[in-house]
Amino acid sequence: CDLPETHSLDNRRTLMLLAQMSRISPSSCLMDRHDFGFPQEEFDGNQFQKAPAISVLHELIQQIFNLFTTKDSSAAWDEDLLDKFCTELYQQLNDLEACVMQEERVGETPLMNADSILAVKKYFRRITLYLTEKKYSPCAWEVVRAEIMRSLSLSTNLQERLRRKE
């Protein structure tokens, strides 16, 4: 399954929007810093086959979309930027979904992939637990925004590698 040529551009636009969404200086939130345990092993392994990579990427984007379409998220960010950001994510989800479904039909997604998807789910569970613990404070959201930028950047690197493999 070939992702559209525009997909990489969408990724960069998503990252740009997320950067613009910042409302407070990260330096004012140093006390709120947190290690969420991003499952980097699931994204930077040389053993990465294309089929599992796509379904893990789909899970990552889906979880980011879920996080930023909550009621609490709406209250934290500029409405226009948030709307654009979520629209970009939704487009990426559609692209990835088509590939995931195609690979499921030809039975390409190995069972091993269940581990990676679960690791991504647990990562987002830690993020939501943190936001709850911090009562969805502006600094907590800023910490999460910076964390999602990092994970999106890493996933973008994986997508570029996948494209080069094709």
């Epitope: 290690d35 345990g37 091993m112 581990d115 990676s116 679960l118 830690r126």
Partner: antibody, heavy 122, light 107 residues
Amino acid sequence: EMQLMESGGGLVQPGGSLRLSCVASGFTFKSFAMSWVRQAPGKGLEWVASVGSQGGSKYYAPSVKGRFSISRDNSNNTLYVQMNSLGVEDTAFYYCVKETDAVATMDALDMWGQGTLVIVST
Amino acid sequence: DIRVTQSPSSLSASVGDRVSISCQTSQSVNIYLNWYQQRPGKGPQLLISAASTLQSGVPSRFSGSGSGTDFILTIISLQPEDSASYYCQQGYITPYTFGQGTKVEIK
């Protein structure tokens, strides 16, 4: 009865290699993440590595990354760790451990073997 | 990595005493803190998971409390068979990290 039985420990020279095995019984091995945890004689516990239920996710302690490799064979209910470039600091009892969930993190280590002793010495 | 600090490193108490062991983590681990008991010459055994969930078969004199960064293991009425080393461990992110251990002796 749920059981974990480690084997493969012994005396090895610095720079040498060793492969430990752990045979599981009494539970559905393929449904749980597994770990290796070590304990130097008279010292505390140190987590070494974890592998997801399907063998897809692998995590390592910084002290062993690049030297140790964890793997599993679900058809034979067996967990392995291949240990290379061993140093005297790797001398310890190595425990095979079952995790409470299918992949590492946000879990507990709810079942431990009796351990196998690895001695790295000249 | 998350640092886990346990105290005291050892304690001596009489049968029937109430004993508490403290565990602190360098960042919040929510409730993902586990406690283990290791008797001499044996492998560790899980006592309490997720800060306060007592494992099946573990006597009710053991209890755990806390969340975030501060946790406590309490033995309400110390028994001779409780002579062992106790370890806390964060299961929040890898690398999993353990406290240094607390050796409990019976006077």
